[in-house]
């Protein structure tokens, strides 16, 4: 084993960790569990304890990211570098980052949780044997109802354990149809659809109607993602395998390596490869998040790489189902922290729960259990009619307005709205806006005309925010909201459409609150807002001063900048940082002098 220069280590034994965000590759509960098990490896042999917390004060902040992701060590795309971690210390030190360009699994293929069937929700086992054939993705073979299913053990023929895979034919998510399955075909804008579609939406989410006519009934849901058959590479990345498909006149109902010399599995993304030539690679085994995390946490605790090939801290990934820690790993971590004080616990014996009654459902019959649980997310509006066009990339061609003293941002007393868009701060006032990038000697650029960049907007804005994942921009003015995706606009829409009652005269600000969620402010009140659903949770209404004690009650703008919350009143701001799950005012200052670095003359 090796430790870092100077034996870098934590000087307390109660280590905290925060899971800042998640990969889409695995259910959140599986990710939570993988990290908890990875930490448990180290706590089992040392005096260390690991406690999950929900704030960035944590000793170890865990983050999924791609390429340039906020530190000086960008990731390299799929394969190669899987993750990295910083040695113990304050700030970013001790943090662990995972490359989300990898396929994260538990080391044995994509994790597809099942519903119904007879396997108590166990995940699919890929590959599995059914009627003597090997399947590396969910299949509809053996069924007449088109429902995809999988075996939850390596061999269905011998074990008879199965479940149904996520499928729009079984259920939908969110939407406004209580999770009912898709109805195919369905009519949307006069056209017939026999599969999920992204038409009418600008965010790329696949949806379907849950009745035969969306135009009439306006009932819809979002289609579940199928990790097992979402292809990579080829010429259809991100699309789904279509089974069965025809290749060289032969029908395939599972991924195949036919036609390739390298043995890699592929599938067609239409029913006929011969005519359409659309294809992609099927998901591989993926990397075990548990094993990679256990290795990275070793770094985060102070271990460098080991020269022992069997050790967890050896620098090469190797999937194993045996105990991951080698004696060398144990010696290394104990060199830093000492042994666990009490007697070592016996390894837990894990037993697979067995059903108490013989299964009553097999893949040749329909599921006997119907979905009973409602989707957890609130209702969303119908898909917005008509595609809104791709975002316009590249620099803006905004016009600079002729300069007069009032056009210098430093001479603006009170801005209408302020928002962090991309990595710049945008400041809006009376039909104009300025851009500001923090840096020594930086000055706000502009003014530019709002009408040049966002022609649909009014001159006076109350608040603006960018949703980072989709890059959507929300502009609020009075009782209306406009949503821009690139150059395409949806709106104006009334605030009622977001679930805000008639007593809400304006939205005065927004803060991020987890993935795809925001807090919307209006005067002294705030609500949780689901960006994808574009709907507030009416039950989430709260008083600002309960969540943010110490800020003024009559703020006219609330915005987020550099991960901190700013509450503006008059020319001043109250800056709030979150520490130990408490929101505390840590600075009061002038917008112009302290944020924009304007000279105080």
């Amino acid at each position: 084993f090796q430790t870092f220069e100077g034996d870098l280590k934590w000087h307390h034994h109660n280590i905290t960790y925060w899971i800042q965000n998640y990969s889409e590759d695995l259910p959140r509960a599986v990710i939570d569990d993988a990290f908890a098990r990875a930490f448990a490896l180290w706590s089992a042999v040392t005096p260390l304890t690991f406690t999950r917390v929900y704030s960035r004060d944590a000793d170890i902040v865990i983050q999924f990211g791609v390429a340039e992701h906020g530190d000086g060590y960008p990731f390299d795309g799929k394969d190669g570098l899987l993750a990295h971690a910083f040695p113990p210390g304050p700030g970013i030190q001790g943090d662990a980052h995972f490359d989300d360009d990898e396929l994260w699994s538990l080391g044995k293929g994509v994790v597809v949780p099942t519903r119904f069937g007879n396997a108590d929700g166990a995940a699919c086992h890929f590959p599995f044997i059914f009627e003597g054939r090997s399947y590396s993705a969910c299949t509809t073979d053996g069924r007449s109802d088109g429902l995809p299913w999988c075996s939850t053990t390596a061999n269905y023929d011998t074990d008879d354990r199965f479940g149904f895979c996520p499928s729009e034919r079984l259920y939908t998510q969110d939407g406004n149809a209580d999770g009912k399955p898709c109805q195919f075909p369905f009519i949307f804008q006069g056209q017939s659809y026999s599969a999920c579609t992204t038409d009418g939406r600008s965010d790329g989410y696949r949806w379907c109607a849950t009745t035969a006519n969306y135009d009439r009934d306006k009932l819809f849901g979002f289609c579940p993602t199928r990790a097992d058959s979402t292809v990579m590479g080829g010429n259809s990345a991100g699309e789904l395998c279509v089974f069965p498909f025809t290749f060289l006149g032969k029908e395939y109902s599972t991924c195949t390596s036919e036609g390739r010399g390298d043995g890699r599995l592929w599938c067609a993304t239409t029913s006929n490869f011969d005519s359409d030539k659309k294809w992609g690679f099927c998901p591989d085994q993926g990397y075990s998040l548990f094993l990679v995390a256990a290795h990275e946490f070793g770094h985060a605790l102070g271990l460098d790489h080991s020269s022992v090939p069997e050790a967890l801290m050896y620098p090469m990934y190797r999937f194993t189902e045996g105990p991951p820690l080698h004696k060398d790993d144990v010696n290394g971590i104990r060199h830093l922290y000492g042994p666990r004080p009490e007697p070592e616990p016996r390894p837990p014996t894990t037993t697979t729960p067995q059903p108490t009654a013989p299964p009553t459902v097999c893949p040749t019959g329909p599921p006997t259990v119907h979905p009973s649980e409602r989707p957890t997310a609130g209702p969303t509006g119908p898909p917005s009619a008509g595609p809104t066009g791709p975002p316009t990339a590249g620099p803006s061609t905004a016009t600079t307005v002729p300069l007069s003293p009032v056009d210098d941002a430093c001479n603006v007393n009170i801005f209408d709205a302020i928002a962090e868009i991309g990595n710049q701060l945008y400041l809006f006032k009376d039909g104009k806006y300025w851009r500001f990038s923090e840096g020594r000697g930086s000055r706000p650029q502009g003014p530019f005309l709002i009408a040049d960049k966002w022609p649909a907007l009014p001159r006076k804005l109350d608040s603006v925010f960018e949703e980072r994942l989709s890059k959507k921009l929300f502009f609020f003015s009075g009782r209306q909201v406009w949503v821009y995706t690139g150059a395409s606009v949806l709106g104006p829409r009334r605030l009622d459409k977001l679930g805000l009652g008639a007593d809400v005269a304006q939205v005065t600000g927004a803060l991020r609150s987890g993935r795809g969620k925001m807090l919307l402010f209006s005067g002294r009140r705030l609500w949780r807002f689901d960006v994808k659903a574009q709907m507030v949770d009416p039950r989430s209404a709260s008083e600002v001063d309960r969540m943010f004690p110490g800020v003024p009650l009559d703020t006219h703008d609330v915005f987020q900048y550099r991960e901190k919350a700013y509450f503006c009143q008059d020319r001043f701001y109250w800056r709030v940082s979150s520490r130990s799950e408490l929101n505390q005012v840590d600075q009061v200052g002038y917008v112009t002098y302290d944020i924009l670095q304007c000279p105080e003359d």
Partner: antibody, heavy 124, light 107 residues
Amino acid sequence: EVQLLESGGGLVQPGGSLRLSCAASGFTFSTYPMWWVRQAPGKGLEWVSYIYPSGGGTFYADSVKGRFTISRDNSKNTLYLQMNSLRAEDTAVYYCAKDRAYGDYVGWNGFDYWGQGTLVTVSS
Amino acid sequence: DIQMTQSPATLSLSPGERATLSCRASQSISSFLAWYQQKPGQAPRLLIYDASYRATGIPARFSGSGSGTDFTLTISSLEPEDYAVYYCQQRGNWPITFGQGTRLEIK
């Protein structure tokens, strides 16, 4: 003994191309990220490009993006920089440098070995 | 991009004196800072990595300190061979950036 030896520099006209090479020895080349850093006459240091050990991840300074391509051949222990559409402002001494950091341990920030540099002059 | 500002631009000191070179980052870079020495016609040479660790073969008179935004390179007693240009470089955020350099000259 670690050695990095650049070659391929010279005089080229604006719009022209050059290919720089950097032969590495004395360390396990395939384990370390590598860099190209340049220095215009009388000026400071500026990073140009960065490549991961496997060659899978490549990164470029905005000033050269779309014109320069970094690559490596781990079997030959050699780093390359293909420079196209050269401009007068690309005139500089080009250094290849070895990263101290490696793999998934992010620390040890610094370039611990540098080549002697090769001069690229872009002029008509 | 993070700006690195070195001061002073030029430092004139006699052999045996203590040299203190400063480097300031426009935002926090934790301890991801390196110092290099460059003599005319030569490649840069790594002196300090991760703000305070001496690179292999660097004499003990060189030391680095600081974290966050303010960093210092100290040469406790100048030797004739120490006169050169010194650069700091950050890797707290992408892309990496270098300071503009401090020229250390004989007084």
